[in-house]
Interface confidence: medium
């Protein structure tokens, strides 16, 4: 047939939609690849195609859209499923064209089962509330669109398997559940059914995601060096491994960069004619604080590398830190003979 | 602008089997549905099934099931409708519509295919 | 399947009056995946309406649609001599498409 330009396969866009759900699914031309909406496309009298290959097979055909009960249907840019089945799983396309112009892109759709606890194979989101912040909220992702403003729906919260109710501090108040403060044991998953109705039919629609609990604003402070320290001299004789540690502990922050780097004379360590090595381990706390060590590392180290500055820095969106590692050439042990010639005045 | 000719009338007698062509000219012919849709005389509209030329997959309505064949030819721009077993209720216009491109309704029509079917 | 049952039979009018044609599904058109066609004598059906609501290209504007769920309407503000017609209503959104059996605009 003519010829297309083709995105390809968008495994960037891993659909993953629950079993017997409702699912509203954009074409991602729009979304990620052309400079143009649909709207426009549709007044320029481009036609958008839907098709779809089954999971494990090569054949590409047209998705029916004539199945009883309108189970599959196209408005606008939007693939619709009311409900999906599970052998729905597959690559669908979506191809934009008229006689002149064509572009597609495919894209993975899997259709998913859930057991009674709402466990199932779904990538979660993650949702960060901060520990004892005060009231904060997370409301019931990617429902628009599913019924207009005019239907009110029935949402029931879960905290894993239970349904939220009577629970101490956290209220579920439509799309939203409060927590009212938030602590380490409020970790876990919570899901959201909403239930509406639709021509004649009840659909529902399962929302999973994780709460972490993380450090609190209130009480992050610019990155801490816990080494170098004034209390440690790294005193080395040449020719010996020079191992130096910076550990750095950084509090949790909302999309920040932490950041820990080493100088030496002032320079980047790869800028220095010298084989250094550094090496970088990271560890979290429950909240989600961070501890960074990197070790600097020269494996035979000369008598010039011991009068060089070496510094470690840290930066986080809190601030930026500094702190010199005492570094020293050992004095050797004087040898025996000089010194009793030294000491009985020996000339 | 995208125009559908039908091929012409056709005589058949009872058991036999008719092949009514649908050539499209002035547009893209492969992207839309070609479905087809009859109609008694002085009765109203009944659809039969259609086809995706690009896909080539057809479907159509139950109670035509085994007795409708429906084809494209990408080449030739041209959609083929086989009814076979033909009883004498198959007398009818028989048209070519195209599932349109903004619409999905049937926007562009063949001008009919009479067949008349009698011993 | 869709059932789809239009009234009147036959409606009897002037040029110049308003036509209110009705079109009632046995299930609800979701999608909003109705059309309404025109046809006059010894010709093909022509698009007047898809999607309910929208005007096919080239239809005046005294042919609007309206409804939702089961129940439709096609209504023609002020009949003009070229609109006495059959007209027909059709789901396109499940299979098997279905066709209602056709309102007939007659001259009075």
């Known amino acids: 047939s003519e010829r297309c330009d083709d995105w390809g396969l968008d495994t960037m866009r891993q659909i993953q939609v629950f079993e017997d759900e409702p699912a509203r699914i954009k074409c991602p031309l729009f979304e990620h690849f052309l400079k143009f909406n649909y709207s426009t496309a549709h007044s320029a009298g481009l036609t958008l195609i839907w098709y779809w290959t089954r999971q494990d097979r090569d054949l590409e055909e047209p998705i029916n859209f004539r199945l009883p009960e309108n189970r599959i249907s196209k408005e606008k840019d939007v693939l619709w499923f009311r409900p999906t089945l599970l052998n729905d799983t597959g690559n669908y396309t979506c191809m934009l064209r008229n006689t002149t112009y064509c572009s597609k892109v495919a894209f993975p759709l899997e259709v998913v089962q859930k057991d009674s606890c709402f466990n199932s194979p779904m990538k979660l989101p993650v949702h960060k509330l901060y520990i004892e912040y005060g009231i904060q909220r997370i409301t019931c992702p990617n429902v628009d669109g599913y019924f207009p403003s005019s239907v009110k729906p029935t949402i029931t919260w879960y905290m894993g398997c239970y349904k939220i109710q009577n629970f101490n501090n956290v209220i579920p108040e439509g799309m939203n559940l409060s927590f009212l403060i938030a602590f380490i044991s409020n970790n876990g998953n919570y899901t959201c059914v909403v239930t509406y109705p639709e021509n004649g039919r009840t659909f529902h629609l399962t929302r999973t995601l994780t709460v972490k609990v993380v450090g609190s604003p209130k009480n992050a402070v610019p990155p801490v060096i816990h080494s170098p320290n004034d209390h440690v001299v790294y005193e080395k004789e040449p020719g010996e491994e020079l191992l130096i540690p910076c550990t750095v502990y950084f509090s949790f922050l909302m999309d920040s960069r932490n950041e820990v780097w080493w100088t030496i004379d002032g320079k980047k360590p790869d800028d220095i004619p010298i084989d250094v090595t550094i090496n970088e381990s990271i560890s979290h706390s429950r909240t989600e604080d961070e501890t960074r060590t990197q070790i600097l590392s020269i494996k035979k180290v000369t008598s010039e590398d011991l009068k060089r500055s070496y510094v470690c820095h840290a930066r986080s969106a809190k601030g930026e830190v500094a702190k010199a590692a005492t570094v020293k050439q050992k004095v050797p042990a004087p040898r025996y003979t000089v010194e009793l010639a030294c000491g009985f005045g020996a000339t | 602008q995208v125009q559908l000719l039908q091929s012409g009338a056709e005589v058949k007698k009872p058991g036999s089997s008719v092949k009514v062509s649908c050539k499209a000219s002035g547009g893209t012919f492969s992207i839309y549905a070609i479905d087809w849709v009859r109609q008694a005389p002085g009765q109203g509209l009944e659809w039969m099934g259609g086809?995706?030329?690009?896909?080539?997959?057809?479907n159509s309505a139950q109670n035509f099931q085994g007795r409708i064949t429906i084809t494209a030819d990408k080449s030739t721009n041209t959609a083929y409708m086989e009814l076979s077993s033909l009883r004498s209720e198959d007398t009818a216009v028989y048209y070519c519509a195209r599932n349109g491109a903004t619409s999905d309704a049937f926007d562009i029509w063949g001008q009919g295919t009479m067949v008349t079917v009698f011993s | 399947e869709i059932v789809l049952t239009q009234s009147p039979g036959t409606l009897s009018l002037s040029p110049g009056e308003r036509a209110t044609l009705s079109c009632r599904a046995s299930l609800s058109v979701s999608s909003n995946y109705l059309a309404w066609f025109q046809q006059r004598p010894g010709q093909a059906p022509r698009l007047l309406i898809y999607g309910v609501s929208r005007r096919a290209t080239g239809i005046p504007d005294r042919f609007s649609g309206s409804g939702s769920g089961t129940d439709f309407t096609l209504t023609i503000s002020r009949l003009e001599p070229e609109d006495f017609a059959v007209y027909y209503c059709q789901q396109y959104g499940s299979s098997p498409l279905t066709f209602g059996g056709g309102t007939k605009v007659e001259i009075k």
């Open positions: 086809i995706i030329p690009i896909f080539g997959t057809e």
